[in-house]
């Protein structure tokens, strides 16, 4: 299971994982405290018949050629968590691990 | 975390879970003993901003916009496995569990 | 036989807009990269743009980021430029052009068009 | 951006002589470079892909070498149909950028 992994710059036609900084501050979220800023990555590219598919799945639906089907996309297919202490909807100050922040590996699904 | 449910004439435009049955023996997977077939779903339709995002990773991308990014794509969001009877390679009977055969669920990511 | 035909140039005033299109023809169209490279009246080539054989990705020169815009229609086997904003200095003929795919790398194009002139004058 | 340098800008050369035109990039784009010709009032025409290797129907004479930094295009023996300007681009990096050209012309 891998994915490639790419630079802001390169020409890869193909699904690969690209870094990304978001910046909480700059989009105005301003009911987060920390981070202000994190490397969040992105997935972005073509998905070629086989290339990366992490599913037998995609495959037999690529083969069984259902109406409206599109092919594979390029999607996170590893996804980690950070850490982050934020204001909820009280005004209640909350440290916790929020899932799915940082995508690890990209691939075709 | 939820998702929608379709049948194949449906005229919804989002992102949508739809019935598929795969048919081994169709594809002329003869290695496969059984099932010979199977409901596998599958996934079909837009992912308009926010609507069926699995991860808020999803909504900063947009929001970033970086260079080369594409929308989120109507994509498994979670998916279970089946049991199967099938050949290998050395020609030896195996029974096991095959990971991520069915779509349970669509989402944008 | 593998072709492409620009259409959709002409003379606007500066701050317009004009939209380009690109017929193929001779391929699988939906299979391959496009891009629109220009050239100016007696200068040499600039890439102005690309788009991926699916249209989810695309990518602009900084000189026309945020006023051009690429798409594709696959089932109609059509690149588009729509150019707003319009300036003395992107009067050029501006060529399409087919994605080689030699390996994972866009950009090396194998087919262009004999382009389409734009003028941007007062 | 990548900064594409040729030499020379005019190359003036005798028909069935050699030709050896260079393309220097500003940073390494690997062997991803390709060369074009171009005559008066026509589209580009591709030459050379990957550095080194020939586009469909493109004669022998022409050759492609080097990678990194460093290429050259060199045309064994000049026919009055190569007379024309020829590009290098590097598709390696956005933006693509190309160089400004070699004029190729009957000395």
């Known amino acids: 299971d891998f994915g490639l992994d790419c630079d802001e710059h390169s020409t890869e036609s193909r699904c690969c994982r690209y870094p990304l900084t978001v910046d909480f501050e700059a989009f105005g979220w301003d009911w987060i405290i920390a981070p202000k800023r994190y490397k969040a990555n992105y997935c972005s590219g073509e998905c070629e018949f086989v290339f990366l598919q992490k599913y037998p799945h995609t495959h037999l639906v690529h083969q069984a050629n259902p109406r409206g089907s599109a092919g594979p996309c390029c999607t996170p297919t590893k996804m980690s968590p950070i850490n982050m202490l934020y204001f909820n909807g009280k005004e209640q100050i909350i440290y916790g691990k929020i899932p799915a922040m940082v995508v690890d590996r990209c691939g075709c699904s | 975390d939820f998702g929608l449910d379709c049948d194949e004439h449906s005229t919804e435009s989002r992102c949508c879970r739809y019935p598929l049955t795969v048919d081994f023996e169709a594809f002329g997977w003869d290695w496969i003993i059984a099932p010979k077939r199977y409901k596998a779903n599958y996934c079909s339709g837009e992912c308009e901003f926010v609507f069926l995002q699995k991860y808020p990773h999803t909504h900063l991308v947009h929001q970033a916009n970086p260079r080369g990014s594409a929308g989120p794509c109507c994509t498994p969001t979670k998916m279970s496995p089946i049991n199967m009877l099938y050949f290998n390679g050395k020609e030896q009977i195996i029974y096991g569990k095959i990971p991520a055969m069915v779509v349970d669920r669509c989402g944008c990511s | 036989e593998v072709q492409l035909l620009e259409s959709g140039g002409g003379l606007v005033q500066p701050g317009g807009s004009l939209r380009l299109s690109c017929a193929a023809s001779g391929f699988t169209f939906s299979s391959y990269a496009m891009s629109w490279v220009r050239q100016a009246p007696g200068k040499g080539l600039e890439w102005v743009s690309a788009?991926?054989?699916?249209?989810?990705?695309?990518f602009y020169a900084d000189s026309v980021t945020g006023r051009f815009t690429i798409s594709r229609d696959n089932s109609k086997n059509t690149l588009f430029l729509q150019l707003n904003s319009l300036r003395a200095e992107d009067t050029a003929v501006y060529h399409c052009?087919?994605?080689?795919?030699?390996?994972?790398?866009?950009?090396?194009?194998?087919?262009w068009g004999q382009g389409t002139m734009v003028t941007v004058s007062s | 951006e990548i900064v594409m340098t040729q030499s020379p800008a005019t190359l003036s050369v005798s028909p069935g002589e050699r030709a050896t035109l260079s393309c220097r990039t500003s940073?390494?784009?690997?062997?991803?470079l390709a060369w074009y010709q171009q005559k008066p009032g026509q589209a580009p025409r591709l030459l050379i892909y990957g550095a080194s290797t020939r586009a469909t129907g493109i004669p022998a004479r022409f050759s492609g070498s080097g990678s990194g930094t460093e290429f050259t295009l060199t045309i064994s023996s000049l026919q009055s149909e190569d007379f024309a300007v020829y590009y290098c681009?590097?598709?390696?990096?956005?933006?693509?950028?190309f160089g400004g050209g070699t004029k190729v012309e009957i000395k």
């Open positions: 940073q390494s784009v690997s062997s991803n």
């Open positions: 788009i991926s054989g699916s249209g989810g990705s695309t």
């Open positions: 052009a087919k994605d080689g795919r030699f390996n994972w790398n866009y950009g090396a194009s194998d087919i």
């Open positions: 681009q590097q598709y390696n990096n956005w933006p693509l950028t």
